[in-house]
Amino acid sequence: AQHVTTQLVLRNKGVYESVKYIQQENFWIGPSSIDLIHLGAKFSPCIRKDQQIEQLVLRERDLERDSGCCVQNDHSGCIQTQRKDCSETLATFVKWQDDTGPPMDKSDLGQKRTSGAVCHQDPRTCEEPASSGAHIWPDDITKWPICTEQAKSNRTGFLHMDCQIKGRPCCISTKGSCEITTREYCEFMHGYFHEEATLCSQVHCLDKVCGLLPFLNPEVPDQFYRLWLS
């Protein structure tokens, strides 16, 4: 059986949309599947790598690598999207390419970044972890760390930094898929909203879905003990 909830929820484009949340109901009238997984049910993607989920994550990363920051021209906010999802008339798509990106580092002025920009994250304005010396952030946004401390400045002069961010990574469903969404949409979809991150590649959704003890390597499921828990 399925339980369907419909609600007007604030979406990425800043408008309220009617959204459906379909929940698979437990045949035996009990906890939901997500709760059962959290409680230690035998759910194979938490025990060993699942090819389907792995393919999904890789596909999400490939898309994210090509994303940019979509800044609304009316200053209502910004969100990380694909170029096709950013209005050409109502917004500005901030994407580094063809020599327009910043240098990789102040010591290497000739090598430009081509991956980015990222809404609310920039190697030039992040103090911790700083992109410098032996720890220069790679030219692949899907390998960027979470910035835990921004430079103390209320304005940076960068379009993708001075905007109000409207979406962050949200882990949705038992498949551990991730979407950049508004907090409202994420909560309505019973997802896990990552306030601290800017990109889906910075979060490990399956780790969150599985619960219990975190994976030793967030990319590799290792909860073999589930075989005895249930």
Epitope: D99, T100, G101, P102, P103, K106, S107, L109, G110, K112, R124, T125, E127, A130, S132, A151, K152, T156, G157, F158
Partner: antibody, heavy 123, light 106 residues
């Protein structure tokens, strides 16, 4: 308000060492992303970049003069010091210090300059 | 080192004229920076990242270009614009400036 002021001797003898001090206010060189550079201008000639120093103490020098230049900072005093050894009459110039910032810029630029100090090298 | 060659080295123009100064780099650069210097004064930034106007700079100033060729344009000369203009690159060390363009009153 950001201001920078250069100070040092107006006259130095050939072979001597020149020490120039840039005292600034309105910003801190411990602030992430900040830098201070030195640029000189011989009378009636073009600008020439000498060196700059960043908030994280990384230093960059003009390779043509590198062996003669040393730049350092004293964050607590809001000062940057440039020393040039073995001065020669061709080093006669107005020496400027300037703040480096990347506000809104993909690279960086000298966005505020001091008024400059004229240094003459003569025996 | 990347050499920047400005042209012309000097030019005479009248108030209200449209003026264009060119800066050619010996090898490709990503962005150009332009400074204005008045006699006895320190330089002041006009344009950063090729085309962005620095804070407080009048909109009659504009910059454009890519690769090795960049231009600074003053759409309608004002009396206070008579000065020397320098281009500068931040693409490779050592940082270099052009030799300057002196703009004089005709």
């Amino acid at each position: 308000q950001v201001t920078l002021r250069e100070s040092g001797p107006a006259l130095v003898k050939p072979t001597q060492t020149l020490t120039l001090t840039c005292t600034f206010s309105g910003f801190s060189l411990s602030t992430f992303g900040m830098g201070v550079g030195w640029i000189r201008q011989p009378p009636g000639k073009a600008l020439e970049w000498l060196a700059h120093i960043w908030w994280d103490d990384e230093k960059y020098y003009n390779s043509a003069l590198k062996s003669r230049l040393t730049i350092s900072k004293d964050t607590s005093k809001n000062q940057v010091v440039l020393t040039i050894t073995n001065m020669d009459p061709v080093d006669t110039a107005t020496y400027y210090c300037a703040r480096i910032s990347n506000y809104g810029s993909n690279y960086w630029y000298f966005n505020v300059w001091g008024q400059g100090t004229l240094v003459t090298v003569s025996s | 080192a990347i050499q920047l060659t400005q042209s012309p080295s000097s030019l005479s123009a009248s108030v209200g004229d449209r003026v264009t100064i060119t800066c050619r780099a010996s090898s490709s650069v990503s962005y150009m920076y332009w400074y204005q210097q008045k006699p006895g004064k320190a330089p002041k930034v006009l344009i950063y990242d090729t085309s962005n106007l620095a804070s407080g700079v009048p909109s009659r100033f504009s910059g454009s270009g890519s690769g090795t060729d960049y231009t600074l344009t003053i759409s309608s000369l004002q009396p206070e614009d008579f000065a020397t203009y320098y281009c500068q690159q931040w693409n490779a060390y050592p940082l270099t400036f052009g030799q300057g363009t002196k703009l004089e009153i005709k």
